[in-house]
Interface confidence: medium
């Protein structure tokens, strides 16, 4: 019996087609992805093959103005239109709290939404009961297939699930659910989830009875043969893991942003054992036409976005200095604003000992591309912010050793004065530079805001201490020469869309007046 698994993950609000790098589509003839094009390919395969499942491994939420405006309603609407068979919850599905998941998505989806390792407690338990499931048995042709879901156990530190959801260890939580499916005589089981490629492989190895793992979270690109675009494969597709009980378990993921449609063909014997598996992600390029009915629907939903772009998010009563003459040379108040927004977006009360789990932000001055003039009635719009942060990046959470941070600040001024982008803007950090000293030895003072304290105050950076820091994904990936961050980071979790973080903060504050306040000094 043959099953075709079509899968997506980490689509992150890319409902419209995008450029090859998943940013805003500029030249339509070279654009990729988008739900209209995805639908064309899915329908083509559904017509050609008998047993097809369309699955999503989480993180549909967060990434473009579509999510900012529609808050998940767009996800439910277009996933329903594409007739997805199941979805696993990703960490970003909790970005607007549990309510922001329940109302727009869980209540509106016509397909099962899954996670076996999220357990609701307290008053939420009855409210959310039945809206998401640990597993679902789906009829496919003459057979049944069990889909069991999982979500990153780190979600409480990456998003806003609140205190009434417990995120258990994936493997511990999955095994009893798979065992339950076996007792129900379901002998073909797919683990669908959002914990990253390493956890996907562990699940394949350790969870008895899982036949296939379809994952997300790590944006992993797998491919057999010559890859069709810029992504470099992390391994072959499918990636085969030998389980502890000796089975060959295919593990797949389909990069991110709707650029590819994962395509996996599995052959099962009559006892539900995988006999063979093969396939590849399909690049959704312009050779695949956009479905006209879905495209028309997209255009209808787009109107509200265009209106939103020019609406006032909040006001500034001061000039927001995002000029390169300031932000690449000294502390600038636009940098302070963005860093304050980044920290605010990551407020997660950890326990009674910590006021927050993270207090620090760094931001390359070169990533700030425009000022905002307060003389336009103080109005700040999404359009204004898109000029400041045009690259469509994310603000991510990393863990770094103090010594790595010190190296980063030395790099910040190693060729000071040449208007280069690596000059760091900061939040929760006080740094003093002495430019008369030789490069690599210019940081004379580096104090950081405590997290394990009831009254936050600045203490000297400890070289051997481990710190959490919010920064642009560009820096986490070693951009602007910050190789030491990429090489030495101890953990990296991707975060929210940069513009969205700042726009949410401005909307929340209503009126802003960021100052230059001595975060960066020169002795």
């Amino acid at each position: 019996w043959e099953l075709t698994i079509l899968h997506t993950n980490d689509v992150h609000s890319r409902l419209e087609q995008t450029s090859e790098d998943s940013s805003k589509c500029v030249n339509a003839s070279r654009c990729m992805g988008g739900v209209a094009r995805l639908f064309t390919k899915v329908q083509q395969i559904r017509r050609a093959e008998p047993n097809v499942l369309l699955l999503d491994a989480g993180d549909q939420y967060q990434g473009t103005i579509w999510f900012t405006v529609y808050k998940g309603a767009e996800v439910a609407h277009f996933m329903n239109a594409l007739r997805y068979d199941a979805m696993a919850l990703g960490n970003h599905e909790f970005d607007n709290g549990v309510e922001g998941l329940i109302e727009p998505l869980l209540k509106e989806a016509k397909f099962p939404i899954l996670s076996a390792n999220i357990k609701a407690k307290g008053p939420l338990a009855s409210q959310i009961s039945g809206l998401y499931l640990p597993y679902k048995v789906l009829p496919v042709g003459d057979e049944v297939v069990g889909i069991v879901g999982y979500t990153s156990k780190e979600t409480p530190f990456l998003s806003n699930p609140g205190t009434n959801l417990v995120f258990e260890d994936e493997i511990t939580a999955l095994q009893p659910e798979v065992d339950k499916l076996k007792t129900l005589n379901v002998n073909k089981i797919i683990a669908l989830g959002h914990s990253g490629f390493e956890t996907d492989k562990l699940i394949a190895q350790k969870v008895r009875g899982v036949d296939v793992v379809v994952g997300g979270h790590s944006n992993t690109f797998l491919y057999t043969g010559n890859p069709p675009s810029k992504e470099v494969p992390a391994g072959k597709y499918p990636f085969i893991v030998t389980s502890d009980d000796g089975r060959k378990v295919p593990v797949v993921q389909a990069y991110a942003f709707g650029k590819y449609l994962g395509y996996l063909k599995i052959e099962f014997d009559e006892r539900g054992n995988v006999i063979s598996s093969h396939g590849n992600p399909i690049l959704l390029n312009s050779s695949i036409p956009e479905d006209p009915s879905i495209k028309a629907d997209i255009n209808k939903w787009r109107i509200k976005l265009d209106n939103y772009s020019t609406q006032e998010l909040g006001k500034t009563i001061v000039y927001l200095d995002g000029s390169s003459q300031s932000c690449r040379f000294r502390e600038c108040n636009m940098g302070n604003l963005i860093c304050d927004a980044m920290i605010n977006n990551n407020l997660r009360h950890a326990d009674e000992m910590f006021w927050n789990h993270v207090s620090m932000c760094i931001l390359n001055g070169g990533g700030i591309r425009s000022p905002i003039d307060e003389r336009n009635n103080g109005t700040i719009t999404w359009e204004n912010l898109a000029a400041v942060l045009p690259f469509g990046g994310t603000f991510d959470l990393v863990q770094l050793k103090g010594s790595t941070l010190k190296k980063a600040f030395e790099h910040s001024v190693h060729r000071y004065g040449q208007s280069t982008g690596e000059f760091l803007q900061v939040g929760g950090i006080h740094v003093v530079y002495d430019l008369s000293r030789k490069p690599g030895d210019r940081v004379v003072k580096l104090d950081v805001l405590c997290t394990k304290c009831r009254v936050p105050s600045y203490d000297p950076l400890k070289m051997d201490e481990i710190y959490k820091v919010i920064l642009p994904n560009f820096l986490a990936n070693g951009g602007d020469g910050f190789q030491m961050i990429k090489d030495e980071l101890l953990r990296h979790d991707s975060g929210d869309q940069d513009i969205n973080v700042v726009s949410t903060y401005i909307s929340k504050m209503k009126v802003i007046y960021p100052a230059v306040e001595g975060r960066i000094k020169f002795s």
Epitope: K201, F354, Q399, T451, E465, I466, L490
Partner: antibody, heavy 120, light 111 residues
Framework: QVQLQQPGTELVNPGASVKLSCKAS????????MHWVKQRPGQGLEWIGN????????HYNEKFNNKATLTVDKSSSTAYMQLSSLTSEDSAVFYC?????????????WGTGTTVTVSS | DIVLTQSPASLAVSLGQRAIISCKAS??????????MHWYQQKPGQQPKLLIY???NLEAGIPTRFSGSGSRTDFTLNIHPVEEDDAATYYC?????????FGGGTKLEIK
């Protein structure tokens, strides 16, 4: 089956250097940090340092800064630790170890250990 | 460096009874609400084996006779009921701050 294979013994002269190997199999070598741990006869465990095989990034216990150098060979999925200027204090079992997740710093998989004896 | 002090250095427990091993850290090993303390078992001539990670999570395949608890600076490994096979040296380990450090070990003997 995730495995870390280490040679059983190394006999070296005082003042010399030795390069210990740890061959990984059963998983994507570049996806997990590799750690090294020292255990002197009848003593406890000491963390030496770790290396990120995907890009060579390292962290050392300062105590071993001028003693140990960690490297990897991605093509053979092998991690190496070079120990220099050996003395009797360096006679010990040296383990390589790996965590369950890319960024977990507890060790679920251990090599069998290489016993280094420094003696003339 | 964070110093981990294990006590007792050795203990003898009768079959079926409870063994309690303590590990005290010189400073808190909690990080944003998570205790970064782990426990290993080592038998003579063998490599260490992970029992419990992040204070209380049982590693896959480890019997439920083993349990961990504690927070901040004080942590405990419990074994109950003790079996013959549990004779070994037990180590705690922290990864709150570089360098990662281990406790001095507790040798468990079965009476």
């Amino acid at each position: 089956q995730v495995q870390l294979q280490q040679p059983g013994t190394e006999l070296v002269n005082p003042g010399a250097s030795v390069k210990l190997s740890c061959k990984a199999s059963g998983y994507t070598f570049t996806s997990y940090w590799m750690h090294w741990v020292k255990q002197r006869p009848g003593q406890g465990l000491e963390w030496i340092g770790n290396i990120n095989p995907s890009n060579g990034g390292t962290h050392y216990n300062e105590k071993f800064n001028n003693k140990a150098t960690l490297t990897v060979d991605k093509s053979s999925s092998t991690a190496y630790m070079q120990l220099s200027s050996l003395t009797s204090e360096d006679s010990a079992v040296f383990y390589c170890a790996r965590g369950d997740y890319a960024y977990d710093w507890y060790f679920t998989v251990w090599g069998t250990g290489t016993t280094v004896t420094v003696s003339s | 460096d964070i110093v981990l002090t294990q006590s007792p250095a050795s203990l003898a427990v009768s079959l079926g009874q409870r063994a309690i091993i303590s590990c005290k850290a010189s400073q808190s090993v909690s990080f944003a609400g998570t205790g970064l303390m782990h426990w290993y078992q080592q038998k003579p001539g063998q490599q260490p084996k992970l029992l419990i990670y992040r204070v209380s999570n049982l590693e896959a395949g480890i019997p439920t006779r083993f349990s961990g608890s504690g927070s901040r600076t004080d942590f405990t490994l419990n074994i109950h009921p003790v079996e013959e096979d549990d004779a070994a040296t037990y180590y705690c380990q922290q990864n709150r701050e570089f360098p990662w450090t281990f406790g001095g070990g507790t040798k468990l003997e079965i009476k």
